[in-house]
């Protein structure tokens, strides 16, 4: 049996694991001293609940949900985490000037529960 990736949130619209965007400045992120650009980042992250088998990433997540139903004070419910990422290029300050650096795991592209 494979993991069931239910995409209907049983808690109601917008309450389950989903992609969320937060606008943040370099100062907000604590990057102002080493990043030149962009001055503002649209940070995409995974936020929300993981009830039942909602967006279960794999069989492990499915098992975790079942065990959570048996002993919820010991086995936590699955967590909402990125399933994949979008790359982002930052212009960084260096000792000799600036450099372009690509970060492959900075922005969430989509989310699942694990």
């Amino acid at each position: 049996a494979r993991a069931r990736n239910g995409d209907h949130c049983p808690l109601g619209p917008g309450r389950c694991c989903r992609l969320h965007t937060v606008r943040a400045s370099l100062e907000d992120l604590g990057w102002a001293d080493w990043v030149l650009s962009p001055r503002e980042v649209q940070v995409t992250m995974c936020i929300g609940a993981c009830p039942s088998q909602f967006r279960a990433a794999n069989m492990h997540a499915q098992i975790k949900t079942s065990l959570h139903r048996l002993k919820p004070d010991t086995v936590p419910a699955p967590c909402c985490v990125p399933a994949s990422y979008n790359p982002m290029v930052l212009i960084q300050k260096t000792d000799t000037g600036v450099s372009l650096q690509t970060y492959d795991d900075l922005l969430a592209k989509d989310c699942h529960c694990i």
Partner: antibody, heavy 120, light 106 residues
């Protein structure tokens, strides 16, 4: 406002079966496990088991396996518990109860209870 | 299964008195939850995750403990506190309740 409305009292003969209901309102029914708890004669509480209304998965206290069967009807936001092969030991008040959070381990909401009396 | 032993079974107190009831688990549990029940009524959530008061519970109540020993304390008992208090664990399957402590007022 979250409400759990249970069906009325039942008087059954030994050996019979009974099915009691718990109608949920004021929240998304499929998002929270529904639990059932037994209280005999004003004594302590016993957890019978629970059901995930979204997928129908169940977990039972070993003591009540074969005695209780939990089901749901998503269309009417109603949970059911059937008790079979009734004996005097099954005479009790039965509660449905819902956790405070979808991942909670304590019951924030309780039905008013259904009294089941087994008597010849 | 984890057995929860509550003591005392019956606790008699005068208004204004400080009282403590205990719940001992046969094995370590991560949290303890407490309910209040009055005759003819459903149990009410009272304290969850060891020390958090449920909605509407007066601040004179508090909970504490860890491992196998937990307690519920009322700093100054009032008449409306007369009830039976049950502890509950769900660190292991099956979920279990204690036998209850009945608080009576003198």
């Amino acid at each position: 406002e979250v409400q759990l409305q249970q069906s009325g009292p039942e008087l059954e003969k030994p050996g019979a079966s009974v099915k009691i209901s718990c109608k949920a309102s004021g929240y998304s029914f499929t998002g929270y496990n529904m639990n059932w708890v037994k209280q005999s004669n004003g004594k302590s509480l016993e957890w019978i088991g629970n059901i995930d209304p979204y997928y129908g998965g169940t977990s039972y206290n070993q003591k009540f396996k074969g005695k209780a069967t939990l089901t749901v009807d998503k269309s009417s936001s109603t949970a059911y518990m059937q008790l079979k092969s009734l004996t005097s030991e099954d005479s009790a008040v039965y509660y449905c109860a819902r956790p405070g959070r979808y991942d909670g381990a304590w019951f924030a909401y309780w039905g008013q209870g259904t009294l089941v009396t087994v008597s010849a | 299964q984890i057995v929860l032993s509550q003591s005392p079974a019956i606790l008699s107190a005068s208004p204004g008195e400080k009282v403590t009831m205990t719940c001992r688990a046969s094995s370590n549990v991560n949290y303890m939850h407490w309910y209040q029940q009055k005759p003819g009524s459903s149990p009410k959530p009272w304290i969850y995750a060891t020390s958090n008061l449920a909605s509407g519970v007066p601040a004179r109540f508090s909970g504490s403990g860890s491992g196998t020993s937990y307690s519920l304390t009322i700093s100054r008992v009032e008449a409306e506190d007369a009830a039976t208090y049950y502890c509950q664990q769900w660190s292991d399957n099956p979920l279990t309740f204690g036998a209850g402590t009945k608080l009576e007022l003198k």
